[in-house]
């Protein structure tokens, strides 16, 4: 039986300042039950970038239709990129629980920010 995989197809993405960055992520299964979250960095100091149910993330939107059934595309788009957004972004699957438990992470996508073209 195949285990759930979290796939981030791009190792790196380069975006000009002021533009939008798309960070791709897909899962191979709808189970185990639990959410996908996006983080920048690893370890206890990592920054939560997107959680569909908790928090306010005005610059981040899911790429897929939010009413799409049985969605396995967890890609996000970050608008108005600045140099401060540079870093490695991870798409992370959690198993539902109290609290949710981290189950599997994608390999990460490094976002680099180019100077805005003059």
């Amino acid at each position: 039986e195949e285990e759930l995989q979290v796939i981030q197809p791009e190792k790196s993405v380069s975006v000009a300042a002021g533009e939008s960055a798309t960070l791709n992520c897909t899962a191979t299964s709808l189970i185990p039950v639990g959410p996908i979250q996006w983080f920048r960095g690893v370890g206890p100091g990592r920054e939560l970038i997107y959680h569909q149910k908790e928090g306010h993330f005005p610059r981040v939107t899911p790429v897929s239709d939010p009413t799409k059934r049985n969605n396995m595309d967890f890609s996000i788009r970050i608008s108005n990129i600045t140099p401060a957004d540079a870093g490695t972004y991870y798409c992370v699957k959690f198993r539902k629980g109290s609290p949710d438990v981290e189950l599997k992470s994608g390999a990460g996508t490094e976002l680099s920010v180019r100077a805005k073209p003059s």
Epitope: S29, I31, P32, V33, K53, P66, T67, R69
Partner: antibody, heavy 120, light 108 residues
């Protein structure tokens, strides 16, 4: 066409055991969560249990007495019911979970149900 | 546990009338509400998910609305085959999944 067919219901004495089965077809069983929902005679719907991969979830009313399991090679869902009580009397429905957005499960296909009667 | 309260418990309606069913949650569930129809002796059937999205094959006369704690299922013009019991369900915070007590729509 998605089909869910329950079996294994019947009459059992209080304290007894029963094992329900649900044969699934028409969808990729192994990648979906599946659930049991019951309905006591003349009453509303009550969620019983859900299984994802090896992750399982139970209503407090059945925790420790019921065990949900699945066999993906047979496309079959099970509910082992032990220490049965009169209040477990109900039609038990097998239901396929569906998600919307990035999380959140509801039930998009249901079986026809199997009646479990707990009575002495 | 999130409690869903449906009202009214019973509704007597004539075919062709507009029907409005209410479901109130004890706390914010965003738009994580589904509606089901159940006819006597049958399994429930999914009508609406995500508060307002119709399931495949569900007639356009069924519509859902609301967010937060107050939700509505509307049948714009009741047909004879629409009689039965309607349940709402929340999936915002589980376990447990919870259902409302149901609204019975019967012939006047």
């Amino acid at each position: 066409e998605v089909q869910l067919v329950e079996s294994g219901g019947g009459v059992v004495q209080p304290g007894g055991s029963l094992r329900l089965s649900c044969a699934a077809s028409g969808f990729s069983f192994s990648i979906y969560a599946v659930s049991w929902v019951r309905q006591a005679p003349g009453k509303g719907l009550e969620w019983v249990s859900t299984i994802g991969a090896d992750d399982t979830y139970y209503a407090d009313s059945v925790k420790g007495r019921f065990t949900i399991s699945r066999d993906n090679s047979k496309n079959t869902l099970y509910l082992q019911m032990n220490s049965l009580r009169a209040e477990d009397t109900a039609v038990y429905y097998c239901a396929k979970d569906s998600t919307v957005g990035w999380s959140g499960d509801f039930f998009d296909y249901w079986g026809q149900g199997t009646l479990v009667t707990v009575s002495s | 546990e999130i409690v869903l309260t449906q009202s009214p418990a019973t509704l007597s309606v004539s075919p062709g009338e507009r029907v409005t069913l209410s479901c109130r949650a004890s706390q914010n569930v965003r738009s994580d509400i589904a509606w089901y129809q159940q006819k006597p002796g049958q399994a429930p059937r999914l009508l609406i998910y995500a508060a307002s999205s119709r399931d495949t094959g569900i007639p356009a006369r069924f519509s859902g609305s609301g967010s937060g704690t107050d939700f509505t299922l509307t049948i714009s013009s009741l047909q004879s085959e629409d009689f039965g019991v309607y349940y709402c369900q929340q999936y915002y915070d589980w376990p447990p999944f919870t259902f409302g007590g149901g609204t019975k729509v019967e012939i006047k």
